[in-house]
């Protein structure tokens, strides 16, 4: 019961996390900026992974997509890649985990198969969460680095003087959504891995049960049939019924839970 709950909760937490990662990736507010000392209008600028937007005090908003790939910073490309990899892995993980859920019966799927699938999806969720956290952290680092690099940066170019406008760039809502979502996906993945341990069937091998009959000394070892089909522990094809002609070692080779004397 606890295993089912842990697995189900892990699935739900991961589902919320991956939805959050998708939302963060699509959001425009990765970085936000207020442009001050502007004689025309107060402007609020915000940027995402895919486009840059400007909102004016009048309410007018203009967004422009980053149509060029070559002109974009390598770090931005890396963040995009990390977020997409996170989404893809998470989506595959969700698909796998649906079939792995203990409460869902699909044909005659064994518990060992469900355990493997649960572990696989758990690992995928963990990697997905780490990708999202890494992506968001790289972007945040890029903002901080740009802020320190831009202080009092002024130079003269071909088209006259260019100077960096000293404005406050702050972490946008998408960064916090990404961090939380990545964390949830990670936690969900860990829960799935924990649930996997409980799902794995424990091997109960009753190796040798010996019956000391009053007449003949007979050793009955369960698994005689298994030996012929290659499933049991009796792989050397020893005679199972040996009519009592056996050594003491043979009888007591494995201590048993059920020794009837």
């Amino acid at each position: 019961m606890a295993v089912t709950a842990c697995q189900g909760l892990g699935f739900v937490v991961s589902l919320i996390g991956i939805a959050g990662i998708i939302a963060a990736t699509c959001m425009d507010q990765w970085s936000t900026q207020d442009l001050y000392n502007n004689p025309v209008t107060a402007v609020f600028n915000y940027q995402g992974l895919w486009r840059s937007c400007v909102r004016e005090s009048s309410g007018f908003t203009e967004c422009r997509g980053y149509f060029t790939l070559l002109g974009l910073p390598a770090m931005l490309q890396a963040v995009r890649a990390l977020m997409i990899v996170g989404i893809v892995l998470g989506a595959i993980g969700l698909l796998v985990s649906i079939f792995a859920l203990k409460c869902i019966r699909i044909g005659s799927m064994e518990d060992s198969a469900k355990a493997n699938m649960t572990l696989t999806s758990g690992i995928m969720f963990i990697v997905s969460g780490l990708c999202a956290i890494a992506g968001v952290s790289v972007f945040a680092n890029m903002l901080v680095t740009n802020f320190w690099m831009s202080t009092a940066n002024m130079y003269t170019g071909m088209g006259g003087m260019v100077q960096t406008v000293q404005t406050r760039y702050t972490f946008g809502a998408a960064l916090f959504v990404g961090w939380v979502a990545g964390g949830l996906t990670l936690i969900g993945g860990v829960m799935m891995c924990i649930a996997c341990r409980g799902l794995a069937p424990e091997e109960t091998n009753y190796k040798a049960v010996s019956y000391h009959a009053s007449g003949h000394s007979v050793a009955y070892k369960p698994g005689g049939f298994k030996a012929s089909t290659g499933f049991g522990s009796n792989t050397k094809n020893k005679k199972i019924y040996d009519g009592g002609a056996r050594t003491e070692d043979e009888v007591q080779s494995y201590p048993s839970k059920h020794d009837y004397v």
């Epitope: 402007v43 007018f60 260019v162």
Partner: nanobody, 120 residues
Framework: QVQLVESGGGLVQPGGSLRLSCAAS????????MGWYRQAPGKQRELVAG???????NYGDSVKGRFTISRDNAKNTVYLQMNSLKPEDTAVYYC??????????????WGQGTLVTVSS
Amino acid sequence: QVQLVESGGGLVQPGGSLRLSCAASGSIFNIPVMGWYRQAPGKQRELVAGISTGGTTNYGDSVKGRFTISRDNAKNTVYLQMNSLKPEDTAVYYCNVLVVSGIGSTLEVWGQGTLVTVSS
């Protein structure tokens, strides 16, 4: 790197008209504000007119009603239509743009200036 190319300056008679244009190129995500400033000999640089992406405009007191600013967002170009020019409008006119040029990077770019002379 962001470049500005200004054009349209020259000699004009009082009461005449002139149209200045300024095109921005280079690493540009957005241009929130584009505008024109001018500096007459021995005077401070002053705002002539500015325009936002959405079309919000602001004019200097001395040019209101005579000058009109417009922009083409697709071409990253700003225009200044100057009518009823006076001798006191003689100055070097500088294009000024506020450019979002990268993640966490906003630049204020000034053109090299184009001379407008109003004289008979």
